[in-house]
């Protein structure tokens, strides 16, 4: 392995790695202008002070310029996410300059050494940007730095060191170890660009988190709570236990941030929306599906600049693969019990029937516990656009379909052996769509038949309600 570079010493010493066998001094950071979507096309290497490659490779001074910054590497070769991202940027922004920052010599080290090298690499990018700014028509406002993992903090340093302010930095699951909780000058922060948006996909709440948990941008988006990504479970990744390791699962969750960003570039017709919320638990309870006061936003490339916000945590659910978009619904369900069923924690499912499609049987996730004689809020989501909701079916699972449900049933029985007739009354369900912000109320057809017990189902149809009438327009007309 190459010799690690420490954080000390002159910048010039750190950017060059002399070798006895070398006839010329090579920089440790290269800027590869990708002139084609084709990964086999070698592109052009740009270097500070050399204008000829800019002309030879048709660098467009007035266009957007993307700098893609990779992270720590154990292989010393670019992973496939980079190829996908380059291709997606070329597809979406045909005239843009796409530059891959190759700092492999400084990233293919022990993790701690690679971390110590991030500052130097950030400095190198800043020097390149300062030089480009000397050219006519080049604007720092058109620069978008996209950093993955350790590369996100490199982007932060670059934004910090450059003369002026770069237009945007996107942090794709910024690295956690050695950055969590540190001073803003030593990690990505909202001060590093005019707009800093961040996707967090692998922020474990226990132990060592590969991705940074804390918010570090103007908006910080935590898909699926920022931890367990659908399609990245042990069985999903490995397919069969014979092939694969925990590292594949880690890669899947960490790299998901990149794929969500790629999705936002190539699936413009299916933009994913995130909703501001104080924490993941509240979001899972369906409390945070509001778009008032800029509380929702597109994710990835299409995110709307929100300079007034700092460290604004936003959440969304996604599918397991591209396109990642899902449709979020908030359900407000008033549950009443005459016989005071105490600890009854029913296993409930809802099926939504819409003008375009019907949903699957969706579980109502009980985040804390169901409050009886009170309104409970739930979050459900569908992979398909159901259109206008027409009716819904609520089911209380009777037979235990899992060990967890069996335990629940047993616990319920122990707590109330003398009261086997567990019964809930639900007269109406209020539904709000996150994507359209429309609110609709559903009632039982016969108000006298609003009870449900284990193994039973209850049907709800659209009904008049004051809530529904308040809001008829979609706030996403100008967002999409």
């Amino acid at each position: 392995s190459p010799v690690p570079f420490g954080p000390e010493g002159r910048l010039e010493d750190k950017l060059h790695k002399p070798k006895a066998t070398q006839t010329e001094v090579k920089p440790s950071v290269r800027f590869n202008l990708r002139t084609s979507k084709d990964p086999e096309h070698e592109g052009c290497y740009l270097s500070v002070g050399h204008s000829q490659p800019l002309e030879d490779c048709s660098f467009n001074m007035t266009a957007k310029t993307f700098f893609i910054i990779h992270g720590w590497t154990m292989s010393g070769i670019f992973e496939n996410w980079l190829h996908k991202l380059v291709s997606a940027l070329h597809t979406r922004e045909k005239d843009a300059n796409v530059v891959v920052v190759d700092w492999l010599p400084l990233a293919h080290q022990l993790y701690t050494d690679a971390v110590n090298n991030t500052r130097v690499v950030g400095h190198s990018i800043a020097r390149m940007l300062d030089w480009l700014q000397e050219k006519d028509d080049f604007s720092l406002g058109n620069v978008h730095l996209i950093g993955y993992s350790l590369g996100a903090h490199v982007a932060g340093y670059a934004g910090n060191f450059v003369k002026g302010t770069v237009g945007r930095i996107t942090g794709l699951d910024p690295a956690g170890p050695m950055f969590e909780g540190v001073d803003i000058n030593r990690r990505l922060s909202p001060d590093d660009a005019d707009f800093v948006d961040v996707l967090h996909t692998y922020t474990l709440s226990f132990g060592l988190s590969i991705g940074i948990r804390m918010p570090v941008g103007h908006i910080d988006i935590y898909p699926n709570g920022g931890d367990f990504q659908p399609g990245c479970g042990f069985n999903d990744v490995i397919g069969s236990f014979a092939y694969g390791t925990i590292s594949e699962m880690v890669k899947c969750e960490h790299e998901r941030a990149v794929h969500l960003f790629v999705d936002s570039l190539v699936n413009q017709d299916k933009p994913s929306f995130a909703f501001q919320c104080t924490d993941s638990s509240r979001f899972k309870r369906g409390i945070c599906l509001s778009c008032r006061k800029n509380r929702c936003n597109n994710i990835g490339y299409n995110a709307k600049k929100m300079r007034k916000k700092r460290n604004s945590k936003m959440y969304l659910k996604t599918r397991a693969g591209m396109p990642f978009k899902v449709y979020h619904y908030q359900l407000k369900v008033h549950m009443f019990s005459y016989n005071n069923s105490g600890d009854t924690q029913p296993t409930l499912y809802i099926t939504l029937y819409g003008s375009n499609a019907d949903s699957q049987n969706l579980p109502l996730e009980i985040v804390e516990k169901i409050e009886l004689n009170a309104t409970n809020t739930f979050l459900v989501y569908t992979e398909e656009d159901l259109g206008d909701l027409l009716k819904m079916r609520l089911t209380w699972e009777g037979v235990a379909h899992s060990w967890y449900n069996l335990w629940n049933e047993f616990r319920n029985y122990l707590s109330q052996p003398s009261n086997p007739s567990r019964e809930l009354y639900i007269r109406r369900i209020r539904v709000k769509s996150g994507e359209t912000q429309r609110k609709v109320t559903f009632c039982t057809q016969d108000p006298t038949k609003s009870s449900i017990s284990p193994g039973q189902e209850l049907w709800f149809h659209k009904c008049q309600d004051g809530w529904k009438m308040k809001n008829k327009t979609s706030p996403f007309v100008n967002l999409a």
């Epitope: 090579k26 070769i77 492999l104 010599p105 293919h108």
Partner: antibody, heavy 120, light 107 residues
């Protein structure tokens, strides 16, 4: 024209070491990676590892971690693979191949192969 | 490691025939599948990259297709120089792995 010229056949005794060379021409040596592949007699191909000539960074298949050492000499655009503690299991044809900068890049040009025979 | 399986180890065909060689991966390899030709003298050449992209200088009678875990190489209108061994290789995950090869011989 891209070319990878490998060193000639080797006949060695068990326990010995050997250094196979692969001289690149027709392209900028530091813009691609060099990979080594083993083909045992009448068998499939096995990836041994690669080296990035730009800075000398290497990555080996776990199976060959203690067997192969990869190096480059940028001044002569030559890549080397040293195989140590040779046994009859190491008898095979060894190829060097050029690859682009991504995992997904194919091995677009191959050397002619170096036959290694290990026999007492 | 990802296992690459070429179920047909040997295939006989005549000049002018159309043949298809298949390759299966033990998990989804996202179309990062390359095909190589090895001649009896040991010479190895790239034919197709990224499932279907023809390498420069390779005749158009060679084509590739597939997705997920299943891929194939088709040679239409076989010519004498096509009789060789064909290997598939995945570029999705380290370590890079190859199929066991399919030897195409003259009938």
């Amino acid at each position: 024209e891209v070319q990878l010229q490998q060193s000639g056949p080797e006949l060695l005794k068990p326990g010995a070491s050997v250094k196979i060379s692969c001289k690149a021409s027709g392209y900028t040596f530091t813009d691609n990676t060099i990979h080594w592949v083993k083909q045992s007699h009448g068998k499939s191909l096995e990836w041994i590892g690669h080296i990035n000539p730009y800075y000398g960074g290497t990555n080996n298949n776990e199976k060959f971690k203690d067997k192969a050492t990869l190096t480059v000499d940028k001044s002569s655009s030559t890549a080397y693979m040293e195989l140590r503690s040779l046994t009859s299991e190491d008898s095979a044809i060894y190829y060097c191949a050029r690859k682009g900068i991504y995992y997904s890049s194919p091995f677009d040009y191959w050397g002619q192969g170096t036959t290694l025979t290990v026999s007492s | 490691d990802i296992q690459m399986t070429q179920t047909t180890s040997s295939l006989s065909a005549s000049l002018g025939d159309r043949v298809t060689i298949s390759c299966r991966a033990s998990q989804d390899i996202n179309n990062y599948l390359n095909w190589y030709q090895q001649k009896p003298d040991g010479t190895v050449k790239l034919l197709i990259s990224y499932t279907s992209k023809l390498h420069s200088g390779v005749p158009s009678r060679f084509s590739g297709s597939g997705s997920g875990t299943d891929y194939s190489l088709t040679i239409s209108n076989l010519e004498r120089e096509d009789f060789a061994t064909y290997f598939c290789q995945q570029g999705n995950t380290l370590p890079f792995t190859f199929g066991s090869g399919t030897n195409l011989e003259i009938k």
